[in-house]
Amino acid sequence: EPPTACREKQYLINSQCCSLCQPGQKLVSDCTEFTETECLPCSESEFLDTWNRETRCHQHKYCDPNLGLQVQQKGTSETDTICTCEEGLHCTSESCESCVPHRSCLPGFGVKQIATGVSDTICEPCPVGFFSNVSSAFEKCRPWTSCETKDLVVQQAGTNKTDVVCGPQDRQR
């Protein structure tokens, strides 16, 4: 009886269970009653990352420098090239097909997490007691100056965008 299902790493064709090609190789010829499946290695710029019956290998991804991309990991016959973004840029999507500049955190916000090649800057509002008076992709919220430790008093209260202003204590007469 011809098989209706095949083992793992096999496929059914013409009532025959044929071996799939291993990762890094493409199908040249299906198996027959007389022959085993024939596979050939992918060329240098190509890959296949699964057991397969593909007659063509996939082209490695191109990390286009015009889009701000650079190679993070060179592709092999079994893996695709992994792209990342140049310094100061991050990927627009998980597949990293193009890059955009990291965003800066506006005054009143500080950097919670510095951007990487694959993730944007994460900003957070400066909580009470902290401020940021610059637009920056690196600076965290800074604590208000402690006037007391300088033997000074608060002359002007701080905000999330400004530091406190300290001044001398009034002398009692």
């Epitope: 040249v28 010829s29 299906d30 009653e33």
Partner: antibody
Amino acid sequence: QVQLVQSGAEVKKPGASVKVSCKASGYTFISYYIYWVRQAPGQGLEWIGGINPRNGGTNFNEKFKSRATLTVDTSISTAYMELSRLRSEDTAVYYCTRHGNGVYWGQGTTVTVSS
Amino acid sequence: DVVMTQSPLSLPVTLGDPASISCRSSQSLLHSNGNTYLHWYQQRPGQSPNHLIYQVSNRFSGVPDRFSGSGSGTDFTLKISRVEAEDVGVYFCSQTTHVPWTFGGGTKLEIK
């Protein structure tokens, strides 16, 4: 239905070449190898080699590698076997054959090598 | 090259009787994928060969069930349970495990 139709009989002088054709029909030509086998008068069979029409890749019996050329013309679903530097021992019936989901043979082409 | 040796060379059989042909190979025909690529076919006078059995024991579509194949490694047998008049011809074994593919010398089946 699958059919392999071969070219007609040939008579050749020693040292000449012969080119036998095998026209396939009834299936997708590039999906299966075409193999060539010969049978000398009153003898058994001898495998010459095969060609993959998808990419032109060949495999050969070493005995024939220097004299046999296997080619295909996918536009007309035809395979060719050319044998050069013929000698009298090459007198035989030459068959093309295809397997995969059944085995199919051409009707055979008689090649006679005689001075 | 793998040498395929068939016996007997000639096999006279009475109609309705069984027949058996042996084929031995000079090395194992077990492929690394677990298959054994040993095949049988019949050639009637003046005709192209006609395949009967592939991979030791699998009958091709349309082949009568009186034909059966068995064996493993280097030792194989083709059996015809009840010979009919249309079975007259030469029977060959062949192997496609090793390149070059090779053939047995043939067994001529004739009716007594």
